[in-house]
């Protein structure tokens, strides 16, 4: 008789999850040689230990502490790029501007990017069938708690001028319910962070509106100002040109507004 299995509303663990995490860890130590000392086997064991045999709606930040410890990494605190709902462009940017870092450029973010995982209470099995959905099932699921934990730590580490890339094509350019809006904004340290600079990325070719005047951006400015951090905002009217100018800043066309 097959054992009864909890059906969740979200997709199950990404196939070949253990192999993927291990391979990514090894790859990361290769492309980031300063992390040569990281023991990828121990990293996987700590990752697994955070959710295996635990109820997938009952995960805490504490569960991830052994993994956080092993993944401790110093990134230049004044070179942090946060993003919300515009991951691909943020990653394209840091691939060109190699001295800036998104969360997914750190070891822990790189390991988990685009993956789903969960276990089952009291069994050592990984659930490849379904995992809890944040809205429909529960918020304290393995994936959500992981990203909340690493996002908080990343924001806490930031200093000087912190940049955030926001998607100007969305109805809520700044969304209080996003990871940026609910976690990172509230964990920037006013004693270390002087300014949050928002880059609002325009979607349409002919969109010349000043999206820095959007009500949700004003809401972000208000939240940040109340935390004694200065706020500034720039429109990026042409993201393609913006990336091109990051690659070739001497280009004569790069002096004009992008």
């Amino acid at each position: 008789v097959p054992r009864w299995r909890q059906q969740w509303s979200g997709p199950g663990t990404t196939k070949r999850f253990p192999e993927t995490v291990l391979a990514r860890c090894v790859k990361y130590t290769e492309i980031h040689p300063e992390m040569r000392h990281v023991d990828c086997q121990s990293v996987w064991d700590a990752f697994k230990g955070a959710f295996i045999s635990k109820h997938p709606c009952n995960i805490t930040e504490e569960d991830y502490q052994p993994l956080m410890k092993l993944g401790t990494q110093t990134v230049p605190c004044n070179k942090i790029l946060l993003w919300s709902r515009i991951k691909d462009l943020a990653h394209q940017f840091t691939q060109v501007q190699r001295d800036m870092f998104t969360l997914e450029d750190t070891l822990l973010g790189y390991l988990a990017d685009d993956l789903t995982w969960c276990g089952e209470f009291n069994t050592s099995k990984i659930n490849y069938q379904s995992c809890p959905d944040w809205r429909k099932d529960c918020s304290n699921n393995p994936v959500s708690v992981f990203w909340k934990t690493v996002s908080r730590r990343f924001a806490e580490a930031a200093c000087d001028v912190v940049h955030v890339m926001l998607n100007g094509s969305r109805s809520k350019i700044f969304d209080k319910n996003s990871t940026f809006g609910s976690v990172e904004v509230h964990n920037l340290q006013p004693e270390k962070v002087q300014t949050l600079e928002a880059w609002v990325i325009h979607g349409g070719r002919e969109d010349s509106r000043d999206l820095c005047q959007d009500p949700t951006i004003k809401e972000l400015e208000s939240i940040i100002s109340k935390r004694n951090i200065q706020f500034s905002c720039k429109n990026i009217y042409r993201p393609d040109k913006f990336l091109q100018c990051v690659k070739n800043p001497e280009d004569s066309s790069c002096t004009s507004e992008i």
């Epitope: 291990l22 391979a23 090894v26 790859k27 290769e30 040689p33 040569r36 000392h37 110093t74």
Partner: antibody, heavy 114, light 107 residues
Framework: QVQLVQSGAEVKKPGASVKVSCKAS????????VEWIRQRPGQGLEWMGV????????NYAQKFQGRVTMTVDRSSTTAYMELSRLRSDDTAVYYC???????WGQGTLVTVSS | DIQMTQSPSSLSASVGDRVTITCRAS??????VAWYQQKPGKSPKQLIY???NRYTGVPSRFSGSGSGTDFTLTISSLQPEDLATYYC?????????FGQGTKLEIK
């Protein structure tokens, strides 16, 4: 326990090639990068390059580029370092080492002499 | 390539002495520095990683410090078995590079 056991000493003529092996045991072979370092007689340590046993991708020091080839055989958990067009100043002890916790092989003496 | 300049190239000290070896990188390497001990006729043994972290089993008399370009290995109380050559290595960027070594002799 983790062990890296290297092949025995070799004597080669100038212009020849040498292939040194490094048999890994006691850990998951594809989970750690393997690097190669050499030490000429009475000299310091010189880093040659690194290989990812999982993907086979390599990164060589410029000095050895074009002469060194690092490979792995995953079925036997063995890493190899081949150095071609040998010269007398390639006479050295060649070491393999594993990323994380700094495990090293015992070294292989390669003597290049006519 | 990043140059690692180690000093002194040799030193002689007595049992119980505090010994300091320094290493200077030609450019900023953050904390991506390791220290190795090589005893005569043996493979090198890694003592320190990330500039200041001791590997398991390494005696507490060995400590590392520094970041950026200047790094130090300290032996707080020299023991007879510490007779060896010590090397620093940067692993911030490929190719990894070693200092030229410090030969430590016991008086």
């Amino acid at each position: 326990q983790v062990q890296l056991v290297q092949s025995g000493a070799e004597v080669k003529k100038p212009g020849a090639s040498v292939k040194v092996s490094c048999k890994a045991s006691g850990y998951a072979f594809t989970t750690y990068l393997v690097e190669w370092i050499r030490q000429r007689p009475g000299q310091g340590l010189e880093w040659m390059g690194v290989i990812n046993p999982g993907s086979g991708s390599t990164n060589y020091a410029q000095k050895f580029q074009g002469r060194v080839t690092m490979t792995v055989d995953r079925s036997s958990t063995t890493a190899y370092m081949e150095l071609s067009r040998l010269r007398s100043d390639d006479t050295a002890v060649y070491y393999c080492a594993r990323y994380a916790y700094g495990y090293w092989g015992q070294g292989t003496l390669v003597t290049v002499s006519s | 390539d990043i140059q690692m300049t180690q000093s002194p190239s040799s030193l002689s000290a007595s049992v119980g002495d505090r010994v300091t070896i320094t290493c200077r990188a030609s450019q900023n390497v953050g904390t991506a520095v390791a220290w190795y001990q090589q005893k005569p006729g043996k493979s090198p043994k890694q003592l320190i990683y990330s500039a200041s972290n001791r590997y398991t089993g390494v005696p507490s008399r060995f400590s590392g410090s520094g970041s950026g370009t200047d790094f130090t290995l300290t032996i707080s109380s020299l023991q007879p078995e510490d007779l060896a050559t010590y090397y620093c290595q940067q692993y911030s960027t490929y190719p990894f590079t070693f200092g030229q070594g410090t030969k430590l002799e016991i008086k």
